[in-house]
Amino acid sequence: SGPVKELVGSVGGAVTFPLKSKVKQVDSIVWTFNTTPLVTIQPEGGTIIVTQNRNRERVDFPDGGYSLKLSKLKKNDSGIYYVGIYSSSLQQPSTQEYVLHVYEHLSKPKVTMGLQSNKNGTCVTNLTCCMEHGEEDVIYTWKALGQAANESHNGSILPISWRWGESDMTFICVARNPVSRNFSSPILARKLCEGAADDPDSSMV
């Protein structure tokens, strides 16, 4: 038994659970997902039994081996996979455990503006970046672009302090997860702060 293998897949994609076996006489190979049997292979008779019908078209063993390829991945395919190789030549089955993380392809992140104030000609607010469907394991980075700056800021919230009369700045939120990356529509400081310009002490959402 080797150490647990971590695998990553994307929704709609495919992943292969690699299996290298040194066992000479294999009686059966059983693949399990979260304790539920997934596939049983009996090499002697060339039998492959897929436990659930809905998985029949998603399961494959490429190149005639015993590595399991799972296609048309869904979010709920994330979990623990376990393979046991059974043989009369072994006292105990040879086993391998895998952890699969399935991630969604990210759509454009959405940006919302927090409470805005405009004091002494300086517009102060927070921009918050988020994914509409609450995708997991998303890392956010902000790019602040302008003549005077080209900065990156980690995290979903970007604090902004922009003085009227300064050159305009553009803010872009970049969202990443292990399988994809995407970016928001650009936000211009001048447009963002225009609403608060009329009233120097105004606060707005």
Epitope: S10, G13, K143, S152, V174, P178, S180, R181
Partner: antibody
Framework: EVQLVESGGGLVQPGGSLRLSCAAS????????MSWVRQAPGKGLEWIGE????????NYAPSLKDKFIISRDNAKNSLYLQMNSLRAEDTAVYYC????????????WGQGTLVTVSS | DIQMTQSPSSLSASVGDRVTITCKAS??????VAWYQQKPGKVPKLLIY???TRHTGVPDRFSGSGSGTDFTLTISSLQPEDVATYYC?????????FGQGTKVEIK
Amino acid sequence: EVQLVESGGGLVQPGGSLRLSCAASGFDFSRYWMSWVRQAPGKGLEWIGEINPDSSTINYAPSLKDKFIISRDNAKNSLYLQMNSLRAEDTAVYYCARPDGNYWYFDVWGQGTLVTVSS
Amino acid sequence: DIQMTQSPSSLSASVGDRVTITCKASQDVGIAVAWYQQKPGKVPKLLIYWASTRHTGVPDRFSGSGSGTDFTLTISSLQPEDVATYYCQQYSSYPYTFGQGTKVEIK
């Protein structure tokens, strides 16, 4: 020094196959998305496709999806392009490219490797 | 696919001239545009990204502007070392696409 070095180009007959390699050094290869871009003689740049750090996502230009396969081996700091069913119009210099800060624009390019498809 | 159409395809200007290259996208790409310079026999070099941000080490005579579908690369004062082909690239959506290039020569 950040460097990408392509290899594997050469003369191949129409219908043949070729595998290009790109060796990366000077940066943490396993953290970067990587792309292949090609340039036919005297022509412009054409993006072939990209692969994410752990190979779980590969995006291709639709016109090239069925003949090119992008892969990588992080342990070897290497990127690969398997090219099948080659035709004369695939004659080009093939570049591997790294996106700046893992964004979408390329700040590091290999020197390119020339693939000539001819009988 | 998003088409990126550059104009002119080639131009000849004198040292010190202001040179403008335009790139038109077939659909809105926001500001997801980069510009590259490729000198004869060399590899492409990143000049501009996010439509107007200069890459590290790029001389300030190079500037980019535009958003939506119309983008411009400007060389404020053409230098002999600027002889090259310039390409725009959109990265708003897959597949990433490049313009056909603009060849810049010295008169």
